[in-house]
Interface confidence: low
C-alpha cells in the first residue's frame, strides 16, 4: 500500500504524521489483557481514525480498539502472546500506517502500591516495603523495581536503588538527620517480558531522627504524636542533668 490515505482531508497526509506508540498490560483485569495506543503527535486530528490489531490472536483474525478521549484501548483475553501482531491506524478500511509488534516486548506493569517506611531504632535503619499485584500473576511475575528517594527540599536530586524484591533497607547514616524525605517506587518487566516502566506509586513521606549529642536520637520522625515527642525530650534533658 502507498503511504497516503485516499479520502478527502487525509489524502496528502504522510505516514509519519500518524506515528503511534503502544503498551500492553497482561492480566490487568482478572484474566483479561489490555493494549493501549496513542498518537505521538498530540495535534493529530483523530476524528475518523481507528486502531486495529491483527495476527497473534486466539480465535479471531483482528480486533478493533475502543477510543477513550485521546487514547485507543482494547481489553481482551484473545492475545496469543506468541509472535508479532500487526497494529494499524485506519480510516474506514484504509490502513494509514502499521507496526509489527510482539506484545510481550511492550509490557507496562501496574504501579506498585502500599509503599511504607518503618524506622528501626536498634538497627538505625529504615525498612522500605511495598506491594505489587504482579506477585499473583501468571505471566509478568518477575520485575525490577526502582525505588527513588530525595530530601524534600532537593527538587531534582533523586537517589535511585534498583532491586528485585519488594523490601529495601536504607541506612540512617546515609540520610540527613531531621529531614523530611519523599520516596516512591516503579517497576519494569525483567526476565522473559520486556517493556516500559510502570507509573510511579503514590509517594510516601517520612522524617529522619535528629542527632542528639548524648543520647543519640530523639523521636522527631515518622507519625509520632507531639505529646510522646515532648515527653521523650524531657526525659533526655533529665538524663543530661
Amino acid at each position: 500500500e502507498s503511504g497516503y490515505a485516499q479520502n478527502g482531508d487525509l489524502e496528502d497526509a504522510e505516514l509519519d504524521d500518524y506515528s503511534f506508540s503502544c503498551y500492553s498490560q497482561l492480566e490487568v483485569n482478572g484474566s483479561q489483557h489490555s493494549l493501549t495506543c496513542a498518537f505521538e503527535d498530540p495535534d493529530v486530528n483523530i476524528t475518523n481514525l481507528e486502531f486495529e490489531i491483527c495476527g497473534a490472536l486466539v480465535e479471531v483474525k483482528c480486533l478493533n480498539f475502543r477510543k477513550l478521549q485521546e487514547i485507543y484501548f482494547i481489553e481482551t483475553k484473545k492475545f496469543l502472546l506468541i509472535g508479532k501482531s500487526n497494529i494499524c491506524v485506519k480510516v474506514g478500511e484504509k490502513s494509514l500506517t502499521c507496526k509489527k509488534i510482539d506484545l510481550t516486548t511492550i509490557v507496562k506493569p501496574e504501579a506498585p502500591f502500599d509503599l511504607s517506611v518503618v524506622y528501626r531504632e536498634g538497627a538505625n535503619d529504615f525498612v522500605v516495603t511495598f506491594n505489587t499485584s504482579h506477585l499473583q500473576k501468571k505471566y509478568v511475575k518477575v520485575l525490577m523495581h526502582d525505588v527513588a528517594y530525595r530530601q524534600e527540599k532537593d527538587e531534582n536530586k533523586w537517589t535511585h536503588v534498583n532491586l528485585s524484591s519488594t523490601k529495601l533497607t536504607l541506612l540512617q547514616r546515609k540520610l540527613q538527620p531531621a529531614a523530611m524525605y519523599e520516596i516512591k517506587v516503579r517497576s519494569i518487566p525483567d526476565h522473559y517480558f520486556k517493556g516500559f516502566w510502570s507509573e510511579w506509586s503514590p509517594s510516601y513521606y517520612f522524617r529522619t531522627p535528629e542527632i542528639n549529642n548524648s543520647s543519640g536520637l530523639s523521636l522527631s520522625y515518622g507519625p509520632v504524636s507531639p505529646i510522646i515527642r515532648r515527653l521523650w525530650n524531657i526525659f533526655v534533658r533529665n538524663q543530661e542533668k
Epitope: E27, Q32, E59
Partner: antibody
C-alpha cells in the same frame, strides 16, 4: 477439539438445590469464560451469567442473581452452577458455553445441556 | 434489558429456496467501541445451539458460505441462499453488547 461435557439429568423437589457441572477440554480452561444459559421446553434462551475461571470473577444476569451461584475449579477444568430454592419455573435444560472476551465471541462452543426437573 | 424480536416465528421453505430471518433490537447494538455484537445461532432438535455468525456478518469457522448476516443499529437479517435439509431447526439472534446478554425468541425453519 473444544468440548464441554455436562452432568446428567436432575430430578429435584421444590425448595431443594442442585449443582450442575460442566467439564471443559480441548482448550486452556483459564483463558476463557464459561456462560450458563437456560432453555425451558419449547421456549427461548436466557443467559444466566458468566464466570472467568482464572480470577473467579462472575457476572450475573440480575434476574437470576439470587437463583444461581457460579463457581469453577481450575484443577479439574470444571465449572459449576448451583441452583437453589427450586420451583417448577426452574424446570428447564441448562447449557454451559465457552465465552470468549465478552465483546468478541460471546458463546462459541456449547455443552450438550443438563435437564432439570422440579417435581413433588 | 434489550428485547430482541425475531420474525417470522415460523418459516416454511422448500429445499433450495432462499430464506430470510429478521431480528430487531429494542435499542442500538452499536457498542461504545464502534462494534456491533449481534450473533446468530442455529439449534437443531435435541441439540445445543451452534454459532453461525458473529458480529453481524462474520461466519464462524466451518459455517457454509450460503449463510450470510447483515444489518446495523437495531435491524439485522440472516439469509440462507439455498436451504439444505441440514439447515432445518430454530434460529436465534443474540446480542452481546449490553449486559444482560439477550436472545431473540427464535425462528423455526421447516419444510413446506
Amino acid at each position: 477439539q473444544v468440548q464441554l461435557q455436562q452432568s446428567g439429568a436432575e430430578l429435584a423437589r421444590p425448595g431443594a438445590s442442585v449443582k450442575l457441572s460442566c467439564k471443559a477440554s480441548g482448550y486452556t480452561f483459564t483463558s476463557y469464560g464459561i456462560s450458563w444459559v437456560k432453555q425451558r421446553t419449547g421456549q427461548g434462551l436466557e443467559w444466566f451469567g458468566e464466570i472467568y475461571p482464572r480470577s473467579g470473577n462472575t457476572y450475573y444476569n440480575e434476574k437470576f442473581k439470587v437463583k444461581a451461584t457460579l463457581t469453577a475449579d481450575k484443577s479439574s477444568s470444571t465449572a459449576y452452577m448451583e441452583l437453589r430454592s427450586l420451583t417448577s419455573e426452574d424446570s428447564a435444560v441448562y447449557f454451559c458455553a465457552r465465552s470468549g472476551p465478552p465483546y468478541y465471541y460471546a458463546m462459541d462452543y456449547w455443552g450438550q445441556g443438563t435437564s432439570v426437573t422440579v417435581s413433588s | 434489558d434489550v428485547v430482541m424480536t425475531q420474525t417470522p416465528l415460523s418459516l416454511p421453505v422448500s429445499l433450495g429456496d432462499q430464506a430470510s430471518i429478521s431480528c430487531r433490537s429494542s435499542q442500538s447494538l452499536v457498542h461504545s467501541n464502534g462494534n456491533t455484537y449481534l450473533y446468530w445461532y442455529l439449534q437443531k432438535p435435541g441439540q445445543s445451539p451452534k454459532v453461525l455468525i458473529y458480529r453481524v456478518s462474520n461466519r464462524f469457522s466451518g459455517v457454509p458460505d450460503r449463510f450470510s448476516g447483515s444489518g446495523s443499529g437495531t435491524d439485522f437479517t440472516l439469509k440462507i441462499s439455498r436451504v439444505e435439509a441440514e439447515d432445518l431447526g430454530v434460529y436465534f439472534c443474540f446480542q452481546g453488547t449490553h449486559v444482560p446478554w439477550t436472545f431473540g425468541g427464535g425462528t423455526k425453519l421447516e419444510i413446506k
